[in-house]
């Protein structure tokens, strides 16, 4: 942590970017009859950042503080006025007390100054403690941020794993779908072949029936022909002729039937062969189908196990994500409480600085009263510029690399009976 020594006025400009009079005195505020103290406007401070999300809330706090400071300053002014009355009273007895005053100047600072010095030491000590505490809290915050990053990374890794598993599953599903489509296609092809067999059977049945009908018709015709010859003696010769003819016709018919039947048998054999081939093909397809079904079943098994694995992985992931979420919530709570604590410390710190500033001004006032001169009260520049306190920046990032620069202008006006007798300006540059 970088330490800086800054004056009370500079400290104000570090905390807030608003215009601020030294000690919160409004310009032109009367210190007493014949005397007025004013300070020139300070240049705006360098851009600053307070690295907290609560900065906005604190800003409102600072505004309230400024208001209370103004009230305190008004009260102090009133006290100044009463002190000046006392000084006037002392002026009347100036000669009597001059020696005593000289004696007091020569001496060590009063016991009152010692008391304030002791208080200041105590305040500085508290400030140092707060600074150390703030540094420790920052380290803790960094550690928490690191833990959070680790948890987030772990969560990301788990998510990646899950996505990978899902992609694998999608690929397996696609393979299973393709196998199913192949099986369905094969089934359709087998059914197509079986359909052809059904038609072939029908065609075969019809051909056989047709041939049987033809055969039956021919037999009736032959029987009629055979029954024709007349048995009368007169036609014996004709009968023998007819018998010879009938005999040869019978042979021809038989021959014709035989050849026709042979054709039929051939056709039947051909059809039977076609049927056998079709059945053989169907069996081949069935075998292929069985093997494909086996493949499909094994794929289904793989698929199911993968789905089971994925479910388990998802459950595990959900559980882990829940625990991460809890841890995250816990960390965020802790972070929030740390932020609140930091804000509290910052507030305390601010209050202490306010008290300290008030004390600084009061000490300066007392010192001036003790060093009071005969005709007027003037406040040398050194009084304010030498009042130095220690302060530690809460966040090194929030102070820019360049030095803080400010001008303090002390304007001294001497008035008598409402008229300005003497006016002087002194400019003091501070570089941090």
């Amino acid at each position: 942590m970088e330490r800086r020594r800054i004056t009370s006025a500079a400290r104000r400009s570090y905390v807030s970017s608003g215009e601020m009079m030294v000690g919160g005195l409004a310009p032109g505020r009367r210190l007493g009859p014949g005397t007025r103290l004013s300070l020139a406007r300070m240049p705006p401070p360098l851009p600053t950042r307070v690295d907290f999300s609560l900065a906005g809330a604190l800003n409102a706090g600072f505004k309230e503080t400024r208001a209370s400071e103004r009230a305190e300053m008004m009260e102090l002014n009133d006290r100044f006025a009463s002190y000046i009355e006392k000084v006037r009273f002392l002026e009347q007895q100036n000669k009597a007390l001059a020696a005593e005053l000289n004696q007091l100047r020569a001496k060590e600072p009063t016991k009152l100054a010692d008391v304030y010095q002791a208080e200041l030491r105590e305040l500085r000590l508290r400030l140092d403690q707060l600074t150390a505490n703030s540094a420790r809290l920052e380290v803790e915050r960094d550690n928490l941020a690191q833990d959070l990053a680790t948890v987030r990374q772990k969560l990301q890794d788990e998510t990646n794993l899950r996505l990978e598993a899902e992609n694998n599953l999608a690929a397996y599903r696609q393979e299973a779908d393709e196998a199913t489509l192949a099986r369905l296609d094969l089934e359709r092809k087998i059914e197509s072949l079986e359909e052809e067999i059904r038609f072939l059977r029908k065609i075969h049945e019809e051909e056989v029936r047709e041939l049987q009908e033809q055969l039956a018709r021919q037999q009736v015709h032959v029987e009629l022909d055979v029954a024709k010859p007349d048995l009368t003696a007169a036609l014996k010769e004709i009968r023998t002729q007819y018998e010879a003819m009938a005999s040869s016709n019978m042979h021809e018919a038989e021959e014709w039937y035989r050849s026709k039947f042979a054709d039929l048998t051939d056709a039947a054999a051909r059809n039977a062969e076609l049927l056998r081939q079709a059945k053989h093909e169907a069996n081949d397809y069935r075998r292929q189908l069985q093997s494909l079904t086996c493949d499909l079943e094994s794929l289904r098994g793989t698929n199911e196990s993968l789905e089971r694995q994925m479910r388990e992985q998802e459950e595990r992931h959900v559980r882990e994500a829940a625990s991460y979420q809890e841890a995250l919530a816990r960390l965020e709570e802790e972070g929030q409480s740390l932020k609140d604590e930091m804000a509290r410390h910052l507030q305390e710190y601010q209050d202490l600085l306010n008290v300290k500033l008030a004390l600084d001004i009061e000490i300066a006032t007392y010192r001036k009263l003790l060093e009071g001169e005969e005709n007027r009260i003037t406040i040398p520049v050194q009084t304010f510029s030498n009042l130095q306190i220690r302060e530690t920046s809460l966040d090194t990032k929030s102070v820019s690399e360049g030095h803080l620069k400010r001008n303090i202008v002390v304007k001294t006006v001497e008035m008598r009976d409402g008229e300005v007798i003497k006016e002087s300006k002194q400019e003091h540059k501070d570089v941090m």
Partner: antibody
């Protein structure tokens, strides 16, 4: 996507002829048997003809036997139905359909036989 | 030829109701390989028929699960668990066990 698109229908006089076509796509046409089915106006469906994948087996309904001829060109993925000696009772919407379950049908082509 | 008889011819329903259509064949539709080639189609006005259920109870691709088929031998049923507006049209049953293939006369599903 399986698609069957019939064409060739129209108005014809009794005794006249028409040749219907059915263009197939989206499946292995040469692997499946194909059918023609018709539907007379406001009537039911009537199966009329079958041809096997390799054209070796052909079968017709009795109502069209001897008048209609089914054929296919596997190289062109096309099914045909040559209709001759058309009668008024042949007036119908003609659909081609694939496979034993008639799983895919075309949108149909209308044939009107009228003098 | 196998005759397919569908009942009822018309089925008025309210949207969200269950609907049931029956189909009876003149012969058993169980083929020698054990399969039963009974299918259900829906034809919406001005469109071609679309396959819903094949081989008694298998839903065709893209068909909602509110459609289900059941039955065996010669008696079959198509059920729609909750009728939606898009389900309105004419439902046909068909058999491809026996050649020639034959269709039922159709059942018109309409709003009550």
């Amino acid at each position: 996507e399986v698609q069957l698109v019939e064409s060739g229908g129209g108005l014809v006089k009794p005794g006249g002829s028409l040749k219907l076509s059915c263009a197939a796509s989206g499946f292995t046409f040469s692997a499946y048997g194909m059918h023609w089915v018709r539907q007379a106006p406001e009537k039911g469906l009537e199966w009329i003809a079958y041809i096997s994948s390799g054209s070796s087996t052909i079968y017709y309904a009795d109502t069209v036997k001897g008048r209609f001829t089914i054929s296919r060109d596997n190289a062109k993925n096309t099914l045909f139905l040559q209709m001759t000696s058309l009668r008024s009772e042949d007036t119908a919407m003609y659909y081609c359909a694939s496979s034993y379950a008639l799983d895919y049908w075309g949108q149909g082509t209308s044939v009107t036989v009228s003098s | 030829d196998v005759v397919m008889t569908q009942t009822p011819l018309s089925l008025p329903v309210s949207l969200g109701d269950q609907a049931s259509i029956s189909c009876r064949s003149s012969q058993s539709l169980v083929y020698s390989n054990g399969n039963t080639y009974l299918h259900w189609y829906l034809q919406k006005p001005g469109q071609s028929p679309k396959l819903l259920i094949y081989k008694v109870s298998n839903r065709f691709s893209g068909v909602p699960d509110r459609f289900s088929g059941s039955g065996s031998g010669t008696d079959f049923t198509l059920k729609i668990s909750r009728v939606e507006a898009e389900d309105l049209g004419v439902y046909f049953c068909s058999q491809s066990t026996h050649v020639p293939y034959t269709f039922g006369s159709g059942t018109k599903l309409e709003i009550k």
